[in-house]
Interface confidence: low
C-alpha cells in the first residue's frame, strides 16, 4: 500500500519539511487516493475484461455516479471557487456508498480498497474545513444509500464485476477534475 | 519586463548531485506554474515536470525519483540526483498560464547546459 | 503512457505556400483541447504559438492556425515565409498531470 500523506513528503515541494498547508494536504491526499485507486484498478483488470470494454458499452449503465459538469464551475471556462468546492465535496459524500461497495470486491487488495475509503472521508473533513459555504452542501440519505447497496451486492458476477470497474473509473476521474480544480483555489 | 534566466548548469559527474535555479523577474513565480523541460542535444523537447501556485509538485512519469523542485517567490529550484550522461542536456524553466501545465508555456528561459561525464 | 506522434520530418514547403503538420495523441487530451503548438529555432528556447489546440497567442501572426479535438490535431502555416523555417512541436495535457508530454518535433524546410 502507498504511503499514507504526511508520512512521506518527496512529492511536495517543501525544501526544509515545513507543515504542510491546508492546500498541500488536500492535493497529497488526492493523489495519495489515486495511487490506491490505480492498484485496484491493476486488479481488477487482471481478474476480469472489463478494462478492454468499450466506453460505449460500459456508458449503458444505470448508476448515477458523480461526474463534473460544466455547470458546477470546476471547469476553467466558467470556473467558479464555491460553486466547485460544493461540488467536490458532495460528489465525495455521493462516491462514500459506492466506496462502501468495493470493500468485498478484492482479494489481494482488501487492505487497499479499506485505505482508499478511509482516505476519502479524511479528504471530505479536509475539504469541509475549507468550505464556507456549508449549508449548500446535501449529505446523501442513508436509507437511499442502503437500498443501493443491497440492489449492487445482488447483481450477478459479471455486473459486479461491470461496476466495480466502473466506479473506480469514475471515482479517478471526478478525483482528477477535482485535483486541478483545487489547484487554483 | 518579464524574463527568466536559468543557472546552475555546467560538467557534473555521474551519480552526482546538481541543482539549477530559474530566476524570474518583472512578476512573481506565486501566480504561476512552473514548468521544467529539457533538451538533449540534437534531440527534441522532453517535459520533466511542474510545481504549482500553491508549492506543489508532478513529476513526469519517466523523471519521477530523479529530480526534486522547489520554489521561492522569485526562483525555482531543479536537484537533480544520481545523473547519468543520457540526462546531458539543455535545461529550460517555462512559466504556464491556465491549468494544464502545459497548456500555455508562453514565457521560457534561453536553458541552461548541464553535461554528465566522468 | 500516452504518445504524440508528429508528422516525420523534414516536411517542406516553397515561401508563399501552405504546410500542414499532423499531431496524433495515442489518448484524448485533457477537456479535448489541451494541445499547444511551438516553434523553436537553432539556439532558441521554444516558442508558444497556438494554445488550447486553436487560441492563437499574442503577437503569433494569424497565418498559423490550428485545429483538431480530442487525438488528432493540425498545425496549418499559410504564406509561408522564410523565417517560418524551424523545428515545430505539439504537446499535450492528459487527465493524470504525469503523462503531459511533447511530440517529437516536425522539421520545417522552406525551399
Known amino acids: 500500500a502507498p504511503v499514507p500523506p504526511g508520512e512521506d513528503s518527496k512529492d511536495v515541494a517543501a525544501p526544509h519539511r515545513q507543515p504542510l498547508t491546508s492546500s498541500e494536504r488536500i492535493d497529497k491526499q488526492i493523489r495519495y487516493i489515486l495511487d490506491g485507486i490505480s492498484a485496484l484498478r491493476k486488479e481488477t483488470c487482471n481478474k476480469s475484461n472489463m478494462c478492454e470494454s468499450s466506453k460505449e458499452a460500459l456508458a449503458e449503465n444505470n448508476l448515477n455516479l458523480p461526474k463534473m459538469a460544466e455547470k458546477d464551475g470546476c471547469f476553467q471556462s466558467g470556473f467558479n471557487e464555491e460553486t466547485c468546492l460544493v461540488k467536490i465535496i458532495t460528489g465525495l459524500l455521493e462516491f462514500e456508498v459506492y466506496l462502501e461497495y468495493l470493500q468485498n470486491r478484492f482479494e489481494s487488495s482488501e487492505e487497499q480498497a479499506r485505505a482508499v475509503q478511509m482516505s476519502t472521508k479524511v479528504l471530505i473533513q479536509f475539504l469541509q474545513k475549507k468550505a464556507k459555504n456549508l449549508d449548500a452542501i446535501t449529505t446523501p440519505d442513508p436509507t437511499t444509500n442502503a437500498s443501493l447497496l443491497t440492489k449492487l451486492q445482488a447483481q450477478n458476477q459479471w455486473l459486479q464485476d461491470m461496476t466495480t470497474h466502473l466506479i473506480l473509473r469514475s471515482f479517478k476521474e471526478f478525483l482528477q477534475s477535482s485535483l486541478r480544480a483545487l489547484r487554483q483555489m | 519586463q518579464e524574463q527568466l534566466k536559468e543557472s546552475g548548469g555546467g560538467l557534473v559527474t555521474p551519480g552526482g548531485t546538481l541543482t539549477l535555479t530559474c530566476t524570474a523577474s518583472?512578476?512573481?513565480?506565486?501566480?504561476?506554474?512552473m514548468n521544467w523541460v529539457r533538451q538533449a542535444p540534437g534531440k527534441g523537447l522532453e517535459w520533466i515536470g511542474f510545481i504549482t501556485l500553491n508549492n506543489n509538485v508532478a513529476y513526469a512519469n519517466w523523471a519521477k525519483g530523479r529530480f526534486t523542485f522547489s520554489k521561492t517567490s522569485t526562483t525555482v529550484d531543479l536537484k537533480m540526483t544520481s545523473p547519468t550522461p543520457e540526462d546531458t542536456a539543455t535545461y529550460f524553466c517555462?512559466?504556464?498560464?491556465?491549468?494544464?501545465?502545459?497548456?500555455?508555456?508562453?514565457?521560457w528561459g534561453h536553458g541552461t547546459l548541464v553535461t554528465v561525464s566522468s | 503512457d500516452p504518445v504524440l506522434t508528429q508528422t516525420p520530418s523534414p516536411v517542406s514547403a516553397p515561401v508563399g505556400g501552405t504546410v500542414s503538420i499532423s499531431c496524433q495523441a495515442s489518448q484524448s487530451v485533457y477537456e479535448n483541447n489541451y494541445l499547444s503548438w511551438f516553434q523553436q529555432k537553432p539556439g532558441q528556447p521554444p516558442k508558444l504559438l497556438i494554445y488550447?489546440?486553436?487560441t492563437l497567442d499574442s503577437g503569433v501572426p494569424s497565418r498559423f492556425k490550428g485545429s483538431g479535438s480530442g487525438t488528432q490535431f493540425t498545425l496549418t502555416i499559410t504564406d509561408v515565409q522564410c523565417d517560418d523555417a524551424a523545428t515545430y512541436y505539439c504537446?499535450?495535457?492528459?487527465?493524470?498531470?504525469?503523462?503531459?508530454?511533447f511530440g517529437g518535433g516536425t522539421e520545417v524546410v522552406v525551399k
Open positions: 518583472g512578476f512573481s513565480l506565486n501566480a504561476y506554474y
Open positions: 517555462a512559466r504556464s498560464r491556465g491549468w494544464g501545465a502545459m497548456g500555455r508555456l508562453d514565457l
Open positions: 488550447g489546440a486553436s
Open positions: 504537446a499535450g495535457v492528459y487527465d493524470d498531470d504525469s503523462d503531459d508530454a
